[in-house]
Structure formats: structure tokens, C-alpha cells
Interface confidence: low
Amino acid sequence: NECPELQPPVHGKIEPSQAKYFFKDQVLVSCDTGYKVLKDNVEMDTFQIECLKDGTWSNKIPTCKIVDCRAPGELEHGLITFSTRNNLTTYKSEIKYSCQEPYYKMLNNNTGIYTCSAQGVWMNKVLGRSLPTCLPVCGLPKFSRKLMARIFNGRPAQKGTTPWIAMLSHLNGQPFCGGSLLGSSWIVTAAHCLHQSLDPEDPTLRDSDLLSPSDFKIILGKHWRLRSDENEQHLGVKHTTLHPQYDPNTFENDVALVELLESPVLNAFVMPICLPEGPQQEGAMVIVSGWGKQFLQRFPETLMEIEIPIVDHSTCQKAYAPLKKKVTRDMICAGEKEGGKDACAGDSGGPMVTLNRERGQWYLVGTVSWGDDCGKKDRYGVYSYIHHNKDWIQRVTGVRN
């Protein structure tokens, strides 16, 4: 018995294509690239029908439906633009991912262009089906310093010029240390900020001496020391990591990392600092910021900063030799011979940064660590040298500039 003539579906074909079909003849219905066979609301690659004894086909010819990649995945810190009218998500449609500029940029300068493939998956020429990554931009504050300051005997910082600075605060709102934002969820600070004062009779650091993540919080976007303002972001602490070679007695490797419970939103007042690309040149000018004590032992109302030069390592070692204090290779010194400009109590862990004039970007040089009193003549401020421990920082945080 002969079965009726078959019409292939729109955007599809039937094989074999014959003038006539008889009992037991089978045909395979398939669709053009970018289309799927749709039968009874079920999508499939092909569909087979057979000519029956009574001269009818075993099933109706299915339709061919264009492949739909559906709504593209959301990109953290990114946006999606549809290149096709009506925001189409079907075969050959195109979308473009971009990062929330100017605070995030796309890793490897990827085009961000994805096309809906015949398989129903958004595909990028380089990344395949993986989404691009938006990385935080570091060291490029929206507000630049109008004047360079010449925390101890320093000047009030201009709001927004130090967007990487973090305040470590007790739950009662009392600040106790500074820090710097790295990447989107890490704070680098001084290890000595994260433990209680040790018993001089038995100066051994025990786990019980460490601050628990629930003992303190991080405040970013802060300008005033105690007054709250609109740009602050208060963040919980997930985890703290002290440098494995930190020595609380000598302050060697006085650096620690605080992982945030959640990422801050980057904006004009909150932005990470860049990690150093190489060693710091002696004599280079650096800026140190903090809310620590000022002249006459008073705390300032706002963030303060000083501009001071990096001091030759051997000069610094000689300055501290009479006090039997070691200035080791993981430390870097800054200040002026005549004194007067220095970090002080409460500045610990805060940033010492320098400007790369070619790139216009700020880099972290050190974190406030120790010194003999504050701003004393012939005594320099000693800072934990970030370049020395950069590998450890990158290993723990995964942060790259």
C-alpha cells in the first residue's frame, strides 16, 4: 500500500526523499543547523516515521524549531547587551558581556562576545561556554590629590583619595587598626593587629590569643574616624591568616590577611590597591595613611596622611642597633632624619603606597608595623615590606593586578 506524499518541515528535510513510499518504508526527519525537531513538545535531533500497512504514516511530520540558548548567565560585576533586535536568544543571536567600568575590567581583554550555537549554548571564540571574568581595577582613585602632604604631624586626607584603606573596628565601633583592600574580598593588615598583647613572661602566640573573625569588622569607604558617612560599607570577617613566619617578638613578617564574608561594592570610595610589581627604590616618596594618634597623643577626626621618603635599609638598621632591635629584609623603613612625620598608635596595618607616574596607578609598598615612639629624631617608621611577602599574599588570596 502506498502512503501519501510527504512535505519536509520548514527548515528541515526528510531522508530518503522519494516520489513514492510503500509499506514498511521509513523516513528520517531532521532539521537544518540551528533547528531542533519538535514533536509533542519534546525536542530531539531526528524523528523517524514509517509507512504502515493501511497506507498511513505512523506519525505526523514534526516541526523544526529554532534552537534557543535562553537567557544568558549573569556575570558578576558585569552587564549584558543584546546585539540582536528584541533581545533574541535564538540560534546565531549575539550578546556582549562587559564589566562595570571603571571599577572592573575584563580578564585578558576578552571581547565578551558570545553567539548562540547550534547546540543551544552561548559560545565565545576564546572561552567557549565559560563566562568571562570581571576583575577589580586597582590603584586608580577617581579623586586625585590636589596637594601632597609633607598621621603624625600629617594632614587630613582628601575624601576618596585613599579608597583602598580599611578600618578594623571592634564590634563596639572602636577602631583599632588599619588595612588595605586587595582584590574584591581581602584585607591586608599587620599580623600584630590580629592578636591580643602577649604575656611578657611567656611571649608565645597561642590560638587563644588570636582575634576570632566574629570579634571585629571591616569598614571600607571610611573618611571620618568615628562619625559615620554615606559611603561606608561594613563587612563581616570570614577568616584571618597570619604569615606563617610571623614572629610577635621581633615583628618579622608582620603581615596578615583578612578574608571578608562578602565583597564590597567597588565605587569612587572603595577600590583595591595594586600589589607591587617590583622592589621599592630607596628615596622614593611614599604616602602613609591612618586614623592613629597625632601630635599631643590625640586621635584625629578624619583620615590623615603623610608623605615621606623610603630610607636606605642599612641607615635604618643602624638607627635601631642601639635599641637592640633588628630591621630584617622583610621590613622597609620610611621617614625623615629630623623626625616629626611618622605613623603612630592606631595606624598599624594601614597602607604605605607609592604612585607609578607612568601608569598613574598606586601600589602598596608596606603596612605600618613598628617604630620607636612616634616621629622621633633619628628613628624611622618600620613597615612590613609587601614585595618581600608578595608570593605568599598571592598564593593565599589569588589576587593579581
Epitope: N172, S214, K217, L235, G236, E262, S263, P264
Partner: antibody, heavy 118, light 112 residues
Framework: SVEESGGRLVTPGTPLTLTCTVS????????MGWVRQAPGEGLEYIGI?????DIYYATWAKGRFTISKTSTTVDLKITSPTTEDTATYFC????????????????WGLGTLVTVSS | AVVLTQTASPVSAAVGGTVTINCQAS??????LAWYQQKPGQRPKLLIY???NLASGVPSRFSGSGSGTEYTLTISDLESADAATYYC??????????????FGGGTKVEIK
């Protein structure tokens, strides 16, 4: 905007899930909280889900409620409702982006009414 | 858990007058306090955060003050539209939010 849905009359012990649908902003940037108000009574804080998905419940609400979220919705499941759970349930967005610290609420939905009765 | 005790309801005042509502915390809350206004059948509206910061769009007739355990909301130049119930909220973060986020019982303001 923020809009709650799913409120209805349920019998005691029948689990009920309320949904908060957001538009105009991303849940990956904001913390979202649930607050309820029994008829003629004051506001009562239930819990908050952070932009990263960390969930914090009021002590009294632990075990009684479950908060979860998708990319555009935040759900509040009342695990085993009692008549005392009869209230209008509000979903609200926290003021500070990326900060569970400042869990005061500056964008509220209109609320959805749940009545628990046998 | 922190307990917030508000001025007893109702508080009555005339149009053009001033109303003061107090909120007392059972322990120091470090100015982590917000004030809300709620009219019958409506959603709450944020007025003040950080004890004294005015939320955007809120008239300057509303002001907040206080520290430690004692906080105050003041409404001056009262208008009939100010008739509502006012709540204080102590807010906290992270693990401390379990018992930290709590509302006062509310204070109803009536305009004569």
C-alpha cells in the same frame, strides 16, 4: 522594586513558601531581609540573606523559617505554620550594598498576608 | 538579646507642634539605630539611620539623636500627614545579627 507573593490561608502544620521578586537591581549586590507584622502588632525581624548567600536568622526564627534565593527571587519558607504565624510578611532591601552590617531596610515591598487557621 | 523600649502610645500633638519619641536599648548599641514610619495598611518607610542620618527624600522636619542606650526621634512643624506609627530598629551584622536586629514596639502619633 520589591514584591512579595504566596500569602494565603493555610492550615496549621502545612509548609508555606513566600516569594519576594525583585526588579531593577541584582540580588548579588544587595542583602535582603524578611520582617513580619501580626494584625494590629509591631514589626518583627525574621532574618536576612546577604548578597553572597550567607543567611542570618533571629534566634526565635531558627528552625521555624528557611530563607533562600535565586537570581531574582528571595524565598521565605514557613516550615510548620502555627496560628501565631498569622501576619503580613514584608521583604525588604538593606540600605548598604555588600554589607550585612547595615541591615536597616530602605526599600520595602507591600507585604503578603498569611493566615494560619484550622 | 537587645530589647528596645519605645515611648508609650499614643502621643498626641497639634499641627505645627513638635513630637519627641524615645527609644531605650537594654545595652549599648553604638548608634546602630534606624527609625521607620508606618501608616495604616502601608509598608514601613526608612526615616533615619545611624541614629541621626536622614534617609534620602525625608523632610528635615524629622531628626534623630542619641548615643549609648538612649535615642530620640523628633518631628517638628507637625503636619497631619505625620500621623503614623514610628518604630526604632537596632541593626547588627553577620553572626551578631541573630539577636542584634530587633524592632521597638512602636509609638503611635496622633495629630489633634
Amino acid at each position: 522594586s520589591v514584591e512579595e507573593s504566596g500569602g494565603r490561608l493555610v492550615t496549621p502544620g502545612t509548609p508555606l513558601t513566600l516569594t519576594c521578586t525583585v526588579s531593577g537591581f541584582s540580588l548579588s549586590n544587595y542583602n535582603m531581609g524578611w520582617v513580619r507584622q501580626a494584625p494590629g502588632e509591631g514589626l518583627e525581624y525574621i532574618g536576612i540573606i546577604s548578597s553572597q548567600g550567607d543567611i542570618y536568622y533571629a534566634t526565635w526564627a531558627k528552625g521555624r523559617f528557611t530563607i533562600s534565593k535565586t537570581s531574582t527571587t528571595v524565598d521565605l519558607k514557613i516550615t510548620s505554620p502555627t496560628t501565631e504565624d498569622t501576619a503580613t510578611y514584608f521583604c525588604a532591601r538593606a540600605r548598604h550594598v555588600g554589607s550585612a552590617a547595615d541591615s536597616y531596610f530602605h526599600l520595602w515591598g507591600l507585604g503578603t498576608l498569611v493566615t494560619v487557621s484550622s | 538579646a537587645v530589647v528596645l523600649t519605645q515611648t508609650a502610645s499614643p502621643v498626641s500633638a497639634a499641627v505645627g507642634g513638635t513630637v519627641t519619641i524615645n527609644c531605650q536599648a537594654s545595652e549599648e548599641i553604638y548608634r546602630n539605630l534606624a527609625w521607620y514610619q508606618q501608616k495604616p495598611g502601608q509598608r514601613p518607610k526608612l526615616l533615619i539611620y545611624g541614629a541621626s542620618n536622614l534617609a534620602s527624600g525625608v523632610p528635615s522636619r524629622f531628626s534623630g539623636s542619641g548615643s549609648g542606650t538612649e535615642y530620640t526621634l523628633t518631628i517638628s512643624d507637625l503636619e497631619s500627614a505625620d500621623a503614623a506609627t514610628y518604630y526604632c530598629q537596632r541593626y547588627a551584622w553577620g553572626k551578631n545579627s541573630a539577636d542584634g536586629n530587633t524592632f521597638g514596639g512602636g509609638t503611635k502619633v496622633e495629630i489633634k
